[in-house]
Amino acid sequence: PLATIPVSTTSLTSSEGSTISTPSVDISTPVTTSIVGDQCSRCKNGGFWDGLKCQCLTPYYGESCEEVVNSIDIAPPETVSAQMELTVTVTSVKFTDELKNHSSQEFREFNKTFTEQMNIVYSGIPEYVGVNITNLRLGSVVVEHDVLLRTKYTPEYKTALDNATEVVKQKITKVTTEQIMTNDNCSALMCFNTTGTQVQNITVTQYDPVEECRQKAEEYEDYFLVEYRDQKPYCISPCESGFNASKNCNHGKCQMSQNGARCLCVTTETHWYSGEDCNQGTQKSHHHHHH
């Protein structure tokens, strides 16, 4: 026989058949109890008593940390960046040991001129932030430097940064091929040795909202997923409404368990509701189904 626990005139029946009051304790959720000082509180799922209430760990909430949230805050960075380690050879400046001293007049002037030159070279790249000289060495002047790129975070940020790094390669190759010494003369701001241009390394910001979502969802990782709204990622369970993956519980309430999302169906004064999505209604008095 079905055991019904009335909540005013409404109760919830799980789609498997049992009727449960709401808010409910999902018995499939692992229970651990936290006892702090004199206060014994049933803070479950790693939650702890702060003297007033249970402080719950993600993804739990509720008086005893017994319920699972429908959405988890994930915060992608405002901007994402890439760093390209490049080497070019400048032939229009003689190397001196003073160039190794970053506080010397030689270094300051070289840095200023090189930066100006690179700003001109990369002026058409919206992601371009600037250059940073990391080392200068003999031969004429071998310039080891970083090209810094930055863009707003979007789901396609990697493509945007990858494209920008390709344009950087094209532009530095072009300028170091064109601005070269001819007959011991350099008519540009700086001249280069074409063969000295190398891309050593490219580092791109790594951010994966799906990974962050899965980590924060812990044992519910298989049931939380990432959906985008206005290019912002949301970490949601099917119980969160308004998304493509949202579960429609019709005449019922969605609840997360370790087996996934399930519908707890409403029983009213006039109807019982059943089915996986609580869409099958049975009138109490006449016992016939309608959809």
Epitope: T91, S92, V93, K94, F95, T96, Q105, E106, E109, F110, K112, T113, E116, M181, N183, D184, N185, C186, S187, A188, L189, C191
Partner: nanobody, 124 residues
Framework: EVQLVESGGGLVQPGRSLRLSCAAS???????MGWFRQAPGKEREGVAG???????GYADSVKGRFTISKDNAKNSLYLQMNSLRAEDTALYSC???????????????????RGQGTMVTVSS
């Protein structure tokens, strides 16, 4: 920062001479130095340049009339202008490269330091 201050400009009659000076606040020994001019309503043009090792270059319009020189001890650059013409009327400014600049044999080179200039007017 290197400060450059020009002097010696003025009003002169056609065919006469004038000597411009440029005093630098820092060492010019290891720099390429040059003179530029800009006539009213025209673009700036290179007049003369001198490399660290004393090699000089001149614009075709002044070759044989103008001479560039420098005095490393005094950190000064000079432009001796002879047989002046009306078309030489312009604001003349001196310029300096970064330290240890090589390969400045011509005048299209971009200098990083420039002075405010001195006005030369050639008129009868």
């Amino acid at each position: 920062e290197v400060q450059l201050v020009e002097s010696g400009g003025g009003l002169v009659q056609p065919g006469r001479s004038l000597r411009l000076s440029c005093a630098a606040s820092g060492d010019i020994t290891r720099r390429c130095m040059g003179w530029f001019r800009q006539a009213p309503g025209k673009e700036r043009e290179g007049v003369a340049g001198i490399s660290e090792d004393g090699i000089t270059g001149y614009a075709d319009s002044v070759k044989g009339r103008f001479t560039i020189s420098k005095d490393n001890a005094k950190n000064s650059l000079y432009l001796q202008m002879n047989s002046l013409r009306a078309e030489d009327t312009a604001l003349y400014s001196c310029a300096a490269s970064i330290l240890n600049r090589v390969g400045c044999r011509q005048l299209s080179y971009e200098y990083i330091y420039r002075g405010q200039g001195t006005m030369v007017t050639v008129s009868s």
